[in-house]
Interface confidence: low
């Protein structure tokens, strides 16, 4: 069946060294456990995180994200996920694309991450 992928609609802000959570969901909401869910950087499409066949595909991840990401799947049964990035760096700032793929159907949405200096206040 067809669906749309929806991001938060506003930039996600995080402090350097902190964690960031980038949410993404499908509409209408449905169980996405069997889908492929992925996140990559725009515009160069470095793989940030990939979930396929019920498993995180760590081997396909770009080296700069290895060990720093987690797909939050508590609500994947409702079609909602979030990408958690740990130990956020200035270089993490920018555009991310999340996608859901269900057999022969794929859609994407965009999320922007803004990284701020905790010592600037």
């Amino acid at each position: 069946g067809q669906f749309r992928v929806i991001g938060p609609g506003h930039p996600i802000r995080a402090l350097v060294g902190d964690e960031a959570e980038l949410p993404c969901r499908i509409s209408p909401g449905k169980n996405a456990t069997g889908m492929e869910v992925g996140w990559y950087r725009s515009p160069f499409s470095r793989v940030v995180h990939l979930y396929r066949n019920g498993k995180d595909q760590d081997a396909e991840q770009a080296p700069e994200y290895r060990g720093r990401t987690e797909l939050l799947k508590e609500s994947i049964g409702e079609g909602k996920v979030a990408l958690r990035i740990q130990n956020v760096r200035f270089s993490d700032e920018g555009g991310y694309t999340c996608f859901f793929r269900d057999h022969s159907y794929q859609e994407e949405a965009a999320v922007e991450l803004k990284v701020e200096d905790p010592f600037y206040w």
């Epitope: 990559y40 160069f44 499409s45 793989v47 396909e60 555009g95 694309t97 996608f99 994407e108």
Partner: nanobody
């Protein structure tokens, strides 16, 4: 605004091959791909490629179709081999990416592929 120029459709016999190309002007893509729509059916994914080189295929075309892209020239090509009548459809190119700080999707006009038995 992104302009998509598709080429390469046509009529071919069962077992034959065709090559579809799509060129995008105006912005670098995040994904470019090919979708198709047969009469009375929903538009469905055929093959899609990220600018990083990751490709995904519909199960029905795996092993027969190959997508390739050039994210410098902003082009994507679909090589279709071992075509059969079930592949008959209008094939649409789709561009997804950042255009003037906005994440946007654009569709081509479509190109007809007809496979005769």
């Amino acid at each position: 605004q992104v302009q998509l120029v598709e080429s390469g459709g046509g009529l071919v016999q069962t077992g034959g091959s065709l090559r579809l190309s799509c060129a995008a002007s105006g912005s670098m893509f995040s994904t470019m791909g090919w979708f198709r729509q047969a009469p009375g059916n929903q538009r469905e994914l055929v093959a899609i490629m990220s600018s990083g080189g990751t490709a995904n295929y519909a199960d029905s075309v795996k092993g027969r179709f190959t997508i390739s892209g050039d994210n410098v020239k902003n082009t994507v090509t679909l090589q279709m081999n071992s075509l059969n009548p079930e592949d008959t459809a209008v094939y649409y190119c789709r561009f997804t990416g950042w255009v003037k700080s906005s994440f946007s999707t654009y569709w081509g006009q479509g190109t007809q592929v007809t496979v005769s038995s």
